[in-house]
């Protein structure tokens, strides 16, 4: 297993609709034809997998059906979007990239993106 550098933004603020997007960029030492991207969430020293996708030559990442993630790829960049976030989902979201093929296998883990989610204020009742 060889190490690889992965860069991602330090902080992202989710939209009022609970959507957060960030770019995960990896320094590929060669031309990988098969890449696996995993988003991990670290909160209170617990690490959980949020979503994962393996992609090849296409520009769209395909996630499992119940996933809250969507994404596209361009070169060594992956544009990730996480949906359905609420205030309780605030935490550090870490991008993990694996170059699956061809050998050798490379693994890179970013420093994480702190995603802040603020639940929208409920609209005040109107008399009109």
């Amino acid at each position: 297993c060889k190490a690889m550098h992965v860069a991602q933004p330090a902080v992202v603020l989710a939209s009022s609709r609970g959507i957060a997007s960030f770019v995960c960029e990896y320094a590929s030492p060669g031309k990988a034809t098969e890449v696996r991207v995993t988003v991990l969430r670290q909160a209170d020293s617990q690490v959980t997998e949020v979503c994962a996708a393996t992609y090849m030559m296409g520009n769209e990442l395909t996630f499992l059906d119940d996933s809250i993630c969507t994404g596209t790829s361009s070169g060594n960049q992956v544009n990730l979007t996480i949906q359905g976030l609420r205030a309780m989902d605030t935490g550090l979201y870490i991008c993990k990239v694996e170059l699956m093929y061809p050998p050798p296998y490379y693994l890179g883990i970013g420093n994480g993106t702190q995603i802040y989610v603020i639940d929208p204020e409920p609209c005040p009742d109107s008399d009109f």
Epitope: E34, T54, M56, G58, E60, T62, F63, T70, T72, P102
Partner: antibody, heavy 115, light 106 residues
Framework: QVQLVQSGAEVVKPGASVKVSCKAS????????INWIKQAPGQGLEWIGR????????YYNEMFTGRVTLTRDTSTSTAYIELSSLRSEDTAVYFC????????WGQGTMVTVSS | DIQLTQSPSFLSASVGDRVTITCSAS?????IHWYQQKPGKAPKLLIY???TLASGVPSRFSGSGSGTEFTLTISSLQPEDFATYYC?????????FGQGTKLEIK
């Protein structure tokens, strides 16, 4: 030029298994997914699953999980689908297709399940 | 699973007509791809990533849409266009197809 050539038609008995091949040529086999699609007589298209020929990573449609196995042989640039415990509703044409966009397709293999 | 519903399921038209086929997704998807299939043949990729024409596909075919609503348009039908058309998504597994739209000669 890119070609996907599938094995010939099969007639099999209920409960038996069948293995269909898809031989790729004209491109780097390990650079594109190989997808498998089912089309029952007079019906639409159903995605069965896909395999990344380099690592062997597979994704399956849960509807087919357990009775379908996707494999590949990189030395011959050939992908395989094995269907087991066959029943009459498995009678269909099975296609292989390349990549994310299904830009090249095999000619299809008719599998008939009949006693 | 993401369901794709095509409308209409059957369409009768004449050579030279402009026809539009709609594909509605049960959930928002990033892109839709379109295929043409003739009897006894394998499907053929027409349009990928919603609006990009596949190699060798005539410019009378076009695609558009976003989110949950997508369309395939044939600006002026030619005799060779009478076939069945399928939309497909690959935003989430399992990859799914629409039920198909059969385009017949009026």
């Amino acid at each position: 030029q890119v070609q996907l050539v599938q094995s010939g038609a099969e007639v099999v008995k209920p409960g038996a298994s069948v293995k269909v091949s898809c031989k790729a040529s004209g491109y780097t086999f390990t650079s594109y997914w190989i997808n498998w699609i089912k089309q029952a007589p007079g019906q639409g298209l159903e995605w069965i699953g896909r395999i990344a020929p380099g690592s062997g990573t597979t994704y399956y449609n849960e509807m087919f999980t357990g009775r379908v196995t996707l494999t590949r042989d990189t030395s011959t640039s050939t992908a395989y689908i094995e269907l087991s415990s066959l029943r009459s509703e498995d009678t269909a044409v099975y296609f292989c297709a390349r990549g994310d966009y299904f830009d090249y397709w095999g000619q299809g293999t008719m599998v008939t399940v009949s006693s | 699973d993401i369901q794709l519903t095509q409308s209409p399921s059957f369409l009768s038209a004449s050579v030279g007509d402009r026809v539009t086929i709609t594909c509605s997704a049960s959930k928002s998807v990033s892109y839709i791809h379109w295929y043409q299939q003739k009897p006894g043949k394998a499907p053929k990729l027409l349009i990928y990533d919603t609006s990009t024409l596949a190699s060798g596909v005539p410019s009378r075919f076009s695609g558009s849409g976003s989110g949950t609503e997508f369309t395939l348009t044939i600006s002026s039908l030619q005799p060779e266009d009478f076939a069945t058309y399928y939309c497909q998504q690959r935003t989430t597994y399992p990859l799914t197809f629409g039920q198909g739209t059969k385009l017949e000669i009026k």
